[in-house]
């Protein structure tokens, strides 16, 4: 089939980085500057993506592949192929539809993106709060209250504190 196609369609011989130029008797012409073709047999080259404004170039366009963008500091990528740049917030905040807002009491965010999440409820695991939570950090759970009572024997070591960010939702 491939051989038949190439006999019928001279354009199928044009490799990536070129296009089949109808104006020049269907010979393979290199893609013009700022354009590319990522597959063979194309009749046009695609315009390179330009990373402007809040977008910055992560990978330059070549004759065979499009440019890739990411976001300038203070922003992070969203969408397929970084089609959008969303602003970062500070730790202890979340991005709402109207901008960055502090986490409500009882919630935290230890990253510059994402949402505020509830502090871990230590008592659900029969533990006590060892370190209080903040807007930026989850609580640290310690031994159960019974383990801390006077005269209690410490046969088993206390369970390790739960990692921040792994609170039940």
């Amino acid at each position: 089939f491939e051989r038949t196609r190439s006999l019928q369609d001279p354009c199928s011989n044009c490799p990536a980085g070129t296009f089949c130029d109808n104006n020049r008797n269907q010979i393979c012409s290199p893609c013009p500057p700022n354009s590319f073709s990522s597959a063979g047999g194309q009749r046009t080259c695609d315009i390179c993506r330009q990373c402007k404004g809040v977008f910055r170039t992560r990978k330059e366009c070549s004759s065979t592949s499009n440019a890739e963008c990411d976001c300038t500091p203070g922003f992070h990528c969203l969408g397929a192929g970084c089609s959008m740049c969303e602003q970062d917030c500070k730790q202890g905040q979340e991005l709402t539809k109207k901008g960055c807002k502090d986490c409500c009491f009882g919630t935290f965010n230890d990253q510059k993106r994402g949402i505020c999440r509830p502090w871990t409820n230590c008592s659900l695991d029969g533990k006590s709060v060892l370190v209080n939570g903040t807007k930026e950090r989850d609580v640290v759970c310690g031994p159960s209250p019974a383990d801390l009572s006077p005269g209690a024997s410490s046969v088993t070591p206390p369970a390790p504190a739960r990692e921040p960010g792994h609170s039940p939702q």
Epitope: L95, T96, K97, K98, I115
Partner: nanobody
Framework: EVQLLESGGGLVQPGGSLRLSCAAS????????MTWVRQPPEKGLKWVSS????????YYTDSVKGRFTISRDNSRNTLYLQMNRLTAEDTAVYFC?????????????????WGQGTTVTVSS
């Protein structure tokens, strides 16, 4: 596969109007709130408007209130943004987005699918 495809962008003079459409497929459209956001040149993403699954509740950012109208046709799986009295500040790439539940508000982002965007340029 869940897909959102925006259309209707273009070049318009200040004071003019445009109607953006967003064709949805791959999910039960009426079960989910939908949102329009925009990315102006040189700036980050900004929320524009949201509508709940039934189309009964709508929300707008302050700068577009009274000029933009969000609506949806659940029988056609299509979201709309009617934009009137456009100014240069409305120049942006506009994206439609699917939220994760049927209800929405003007606070939390709950977006799980984005479209590819349509460009609106307001210039004389």
């Amino acid at each position: 596969e869940v897909q959102l495809l925006e259309s209707g962008g273009g070049l318009v003079q200040p004071g003019g109007s445009l109607r953006l459409s967003c064709a949805a497929s791959g999910f039960i459209f009426s079960n989910f709130a939908m949102t329009w956001v925009r990315q102006p040149p040189e700036k980050g993403l900004k929320w524009v408007s949201s509508i709940n699954g039934s189309g009964f509740n709508t929300y707008y950012t302050d700068s577009v209130k009274g000029r933009f109208t969000i609506s949806r046709d659940n029988s056609r799986n299509t979201l709309y943004l009617q934009m009137n009295r456009l100014t240069a500040e409305d120049t942006a790439v506009y994206f439609c987005a699917k939220e994760g539940s049927s209800e929405t508000d003007d606070h939390y982002y709950n977006v799980d699918v984005w479209g590819q965007g349509t460009t609106v340029t307001v210039s004389s």
